[in-house]
């Protein structure tokens, strides 16, 4: 083995050593036909044209032409790993979900960490929320807890999601990231203040994936065996300790090792340093929800821990790297609507929107039978239903079982014990404007009570360092919002912007000219 190389760097060497006793496999086409020559195409004479009959070439080329699948529209860049969830505390009084059945119970899990806005080749060390999605393979089917590393989000109404993501991605003409788009949207939607403040704090750039917390973020509903329900939030706190990257280190790493997060996770697991997270819930009764000072289903708000303490449930442990990235990480599909009995959705509008959006995007990206892909398959449950056929149907298509319901032939029967919790709703049906549902109280508490003086200083510097590149009228809107949170918050950012704006040449076209370049003096003068 090469000296002092890490397991990720030595992956191929390790693969070879594992197979040392084996003879190399026979090279085949996709159909399994042995290949005699994989280095030369069939031609008429040494300089002649190709023959269509060269199926070794066409088989290879046609497959290569179709290798790429659409990247995820958000969370395109990610790392994955596998492990287990172990119950350490009894919460059966809240939930009948089999995953929580008894202390000591272990459930296999798959986890994917990701950034949000960047493409699949983008750097791991950018300032961006991180996805932290967990798939629990339970006996009652898969439970997908599609979380982030922040307990809140930028918006509370899902109709804004496409516009929000468009504002974070590339300008439709220039194809450049555009600070005007980013800050115009944020400044016009002050419900984003909470998440923006978290994002531009030290927590905005985690040191890899192992040193950050995870949150289900949404409010969910837990239902016990007696049909009694409570609202809940899920938290998973890193046992490795929170570590973040400085702006300088993050920038350096984005150049030197843009896959820093993937590498760090792979190497930790490969060397037996299995990362773990302690899993907690917060619980709110329906009565408490009625008197909660905010909408308890608002994704831009937190539930104060002082009022709704963290209740420990178990441990998430990651102890296996993917065997193949494409098969197990690129193709994994997390879907918040995958909830086994005992875990249900709350009226959280953003969660409700995701219940549709996630399986919809998977059907586009992976095909309508994406749940047949091994990593997505609920392999610890027996899938039996009336869904048939479709592209890439990979199992036995449920054989000769009836494909209609009801039927008289003993095909799968509904399970009354799996009925959803019933709840009474009444109210006006219309589009409710939530734009001004108290966008500042919790942000003020975060700024004043949670951050110390140094952290507040860095927060303002980080915001100003990004906001400076937006137009002045957008800067003013943003500063007005920060000032409403706290006068100091706005004034510190404004002071930094004033400094930047005084230094900034207006409408400059920045052109890099090599010293001693061959450009004529006249051309240089025109730059």
């Amino acid at each position: 083995m090469a000296d002092s190389r890490d397991p990720a760097s030595d992956q191929m060497q390790h693969w070879k050593e594992q197979r040392a006793a084996q003879k190399a496999d026979v090279l085949t086409t996709g159909a399994g036909n042995p290949v005699g020559d994989k280095l030369n195409v069939i031609t008429v004479g040494p300089r002649g044209p190709l023959l269509v009959q060269d199926v070794v070439f066409t088989d290879e080329m046609a497959h290569f032409d179709r290798e790429r699948i659409p990247e995820r529209v958000v969370h395109a860049k990610g790392a994955g790993a596998f492990g287990y969830f172990e119950v350490t505390h009894d919460i059966t009084k809240y939930s009948k979900a089999k995953v929580f059945e008894h202390i000591g119970k272990k459930t296999p899990i798959a986890v994917r960490f990701s950034t949000v806005a960047g493409e699949s080749g983008s750097a791991d060390t950018v300032r961006d929320p991180r996805g932290f999605a967990v798939k629990f393979y339970t006996e009652d089917g898969n439970w997908d807890l599609v979380g982030n590393n922040t307990p809140i989000f930028f918006i509370r109404d899902p109709i804004l999601f496409p516009s929000f993501i468009h504002s974070q991605k590339r300008n439709p003409q220039t194809h450049l990231k555009d600070p005007d788009m980013v800050w115009d949207f944020w400044s016009l939607r002050p419900e984003s203040l909470h998440q923006v403040s978290f994002l531009f704090s030290d927590r905005g750039i985690p040191d890899g994936h192992r040193h950050m917390n995870g949150y289900g973020s949404h409010t969910f509903k837990l239902v016990n065996a007696n049909g009694e329900a409570v609202y809940c939030k899920f938290h998973y706190k890193t046992d490795q300790g929170i570590k973040n990257l400085s702006v300088e280190d993050a920038a350096r790493l984005s150049q030197e090792d843009p896959d820093y997060g993937i590498r760090d996770l792979f190497n930790a697991i490969a060397t037996g340093k299995y990362p773990s997270w302690t899993f907690y819930i917060q619980v709110m009764t329906f009565n408490q929800a009625e008197t909660f000072p905010f909408n308890p289903f608002d994704l831009t708000k937190v539930w104060p821990h002082k009022d709704y303490p963290l209740i420990p449930v178990g441990k998430l442990v990651l102890n296996r790297n993917p065997v193949n990235y494409f098969a197990e990480v690129e193709q994994i599909a997390f879907d918040p609507s995958n909830m086994p009995p005992g875990i249900e959705a709350s009226p959280d509008k953003m969660l409700q929107g995701r219940l549709f959006a996630y399986p919809d995007t998977h059907r586009h990206r992976l095909g309508p039978n994406y749940l047949h892909i091994p990593v997505n398959c609920p392999y610890r449950a027996r899938v039996a239903n009336y869904q048939r056929d479709g592209p890439m149907c990979m199992q036995d298509n449920q054989g000769g079982a009836p494909n209609y319901y009801p039927n008289s032939f003993g095909a799968p029967e509904q399970q009354p014990s799996a009925l959803e919790h019933s709840i009474q709703y009444s109210g006006e049906v219309r589009r409710f404007n939530t734009a001004n549902d108290d966008n500042v109280t919790q942000v003020r508490a975060f700024y004043v009570n949670v951050l110390n003086e140094e952290q507040r200083k860095r927060l303002c510097e980080n915001i100003a360092g990004h906001l400076k590149d937006a137009q002045i009228f957008i800067q003013k809107k943003a500063v007005k919002n920060f000032t409403e949170v706290h006068p100091d918050y706005g004034s510190h950012i404004q002071a930094l912007l004033d400094k930047y704006n005084a230094e900034k040449p207006k409408n400059a076209i920045h052109t890099f000219v090599q010293s001693g370049s061959h450009l004529a003096a006249r051309e240089k003068a025109n730059l």
Epitope: P151, K237, V302, W303, P304, H305, K306, P309, V450
Partner: nanobody
Framework: QVQLVESGGGLVQAGGSLRLSCAAS????????MGWFRQAPGKEREFVAT????????YYADSVKGRFTISRDNAKNTMYLQMNSLKPEDTAVYYC??????????WGQGTQVTVSS
Amino acid sequence: QVQLVESGGGLVQAGGSLRLSCAASERTFNTYGMGWFRQAPGKEREFVATISWSGDSTYYADSVKGRFTISRDNAKNTMYLQMNSLKPEDTAVYYCNANSEYGDSYWGQGTQVTVSS
């Protein structure tokens, strides 16, 4: 910064009682979630109990349920852990914890509880 100061630990015989206290600043006490954890020699730190600001909601580890009682006095910015019917397996360093909605966790220096048989 958040400062937590535990007291009340000591040596006690099996079946005996102790009352631990955790003092914090008013800002900490009114901002953070509060709870008790413990760490026995050679073991991981484990949850003991947690309490809401109003005292309405309390949660306990199964191993201490019915024997330990968590409480708080918001006027004194102090949280307590009344430990009755102590057992040798309760021997550990007991830590006060404050945690925020944003993942911050703060710990006191710990107070040693030793239960002899």
